[in-house]
């Protein structure tokens, strides 16, 4: 029995609902009484949801899953996963048994956009050209881990003297803090770009130092 799932991962934002698509081709005369459907976590074989003996057996996964009962007879075995969490990320196996049996695995990629970075400067007063300053770029509650890029006002990448740390909170979302140590010129703009590699979403922050005063656009 050929079971079909999308080749590409399903991308779902944290807190939203995701549909894990799975389909099979029912033969003529097929009835739901013949169908045995199992969704499970691929790596641990933990049962997620099942359908057997003509009945939805319900969710075994925190009561956040549902089938599409009206579409099962047409060969649609997709699973709805509600209120997606970081911990849901991974591979789900769809097993279908009628007379023959088969299975396929679909990957769920969880994502969350990063907040607009906040910029801080240390020291933040009495700055002169030639002073060494520490610029911190902070962005919050994103997933997966971010890519961080720094550049100056002319768009030239700044790669030296950058330290980036990412810490996951209890929900598995990352807070990113990137520190740039730089020697001030006469004036200058320093930009931080926090990129979510899954969403291809960029969050920008910048600070402009013009002797006095400083501005934080």
């Amino acid at each position: 029995l050929e079971v079909q799932v999308p080749e590409d991962p399903v991308v779902a934002l944290v807190g939203t609902d995701a549909t894990l698509c799975c389909s099979f081709s029912p033969e003529p005369g097929f009835s739901l009484a013949q169908l045995n459907l199992i969704w499970q976590l691929t790596d641990t074989k933990q049962l997620v949801h099942s359908f057997a003996e003509g009945q939805d057996q319900g969710s075994a996964y925190a009561n956040r899953t549902a089938l599409f009962p009206d579409l099962l007879a047409q060969g649609n075995a997709s699973l709805r996963l509600q209120r997606v969490r970081v911990a849901d990320e991974g591979s789900f196996t769809c097993f279908v048994s009628i007379r023959d049996f088969g299975s396929a695995a679909v990957s769920l990629q969880v994502a969350a956009p990063y907040s607009k970075p906040s910029m801080t400067l240390e020291p933040n007063k009495d700055l002169r050209p030639g002073d060494t300053v520490t610029i911190t770029c902070s962005s919050y509650r994103g997933y997966p881990e971010a890519e961080v890029f720094w550049q100056d006002g002319q768009g030239v990448p700044l790669t030296g003297n950058v330290t980036t740390s990412q810490m996951a909170n209890e929900q598995g979302l990352f807070d990113v803090h990137s520190v740039l140590r730089v020697v001030l010129g006469a004036n200058g703009t320093y930009s931080c770009l926090v990129r979510n590699p899954v969403l291809q979403q960029d969050a920008h922050g910048s600070v402009t130092i013009t002797g006095q005063p400083m501005t934080f656009p």
Epitope: I38, Q40, D43, T44, C94, F95, G102, S103
Partner: antibody, heavy 119, light 110 residues
Framework: QLQLQESGPGLVKPSETLSLTCAVS?????????WSWVRQPPGKGLEWIGE???????NYNPSLKSRVTISVDKSKNQFSLHLNSVTPEDTAVYYC????????????WGQGTMVTVSS | QSVVTQPPSVSAAPGQKVTISCSGS????????VSWYQQLPGTAPKLLIY???KRPSGIPDRFSGSKSGTSATLGITGLQTGDEADYYC??????????FGGGTQLTVLA
């Protein structure tokens, strides 16, 4: 039609490592299947050794876990068994088998290969 | 000694019906699917029943499976001499390990 074929030395010395390979033909080792090793000592019953998924996830028989490693080679479309510190009690016919993920059953088996542990 | 037990042997005449039992516990059969395998002399096991009671394509309906609680049963009707073989039940336990019964030798009486 998917087929499995075991290969490896038929004789292994005590304390050495038993190494077997299972070649998958007519299908891909990267499909939605778990790949298992099962053995059967002469005149005795079946004993499951362990399994692997193409992602690298493994499960092992607790009684053999400390001595067993199962690996998968996607480029060669095969998976392997390594059982170290063997004794004569490891003498058996070794089978590789497929479990379609979710089926909880082994629907395709290799023909088996006899491995004798003796000095 | 297997944690899943089967009778060592059963026998019946051709055309008769025979059942083979498989007894386990809540940590294996009680909470997992049972499969059944036929092993003819000198050959690899062959899947007869999966998911407690389902037959793969090509397996005649003379073979049936059932499960109740922590026990499972394989039934064979219309016994044929070609059915003479060893039969194994298989299941899984809570540690994600497959477990086989000790096997039952079926003799078809001439």
């Amino acid at each position: 039609q998917l087929q499995l074929q075991e290969s490896g030395p038929g004789l292994v010395k005590p304390s050495e490592t038993l190494s077997l390979t299972c070649a998958v033909s007519g299908g891909s080792v990267s499909s939605s299947n778990w790949w298992s090793w099962v053995r059967q000592p002469p005149g005795k019953g079946l004993e499951w050794i362990g399994e692997i998924y193409h992602s690298g996830s493994t499960n092992y028989n607790p009684s053999l876990k400390s001595r067993v490693t199962i690996s998968v080679d996607k480029s060669k479309n095969q998976f392997s068994l390594h059982l170290n510190s063997v004794t004569p009690e490891d003498t058996a016919v070794y089978y590789c088998a497929r479990e379609v993920a979710g089926s909880a059953a082994f629907d395709i088996w290799g023909q088996g290969t006899m491995v004798t542990v003796s000095s | 000694q297997s944690v899943v037990t089967q009778p060592p042997s059963v026998s019946a005449a051709p055309g008769q019906k025979v059942t083979i039992s498989c007894s386990g516990s809540s940590s294996n059969i009680g909470n997992n699917y049972v499969s059944w395998y036929q092993q003819l002399p000198g050959t690899a096991p062959k899947l007869l029943i999966y998911g407690n009671n389902k037959r793969p394509s090509g397996i005649p309906d003379r073979f049936s499976g059932s499960k109740s609680g922590t026990s499972a049963t394989l039934g064979i009707t219309g016994l044929q001499t070609g059915d003479e073989a060893d039969y194994y039940c298989g299941t899984w336990d809570s540690s994600l390990s497959a477990v086989f019964g000790g096997g039952t030798q079926l003799t078809v009486l001439a």
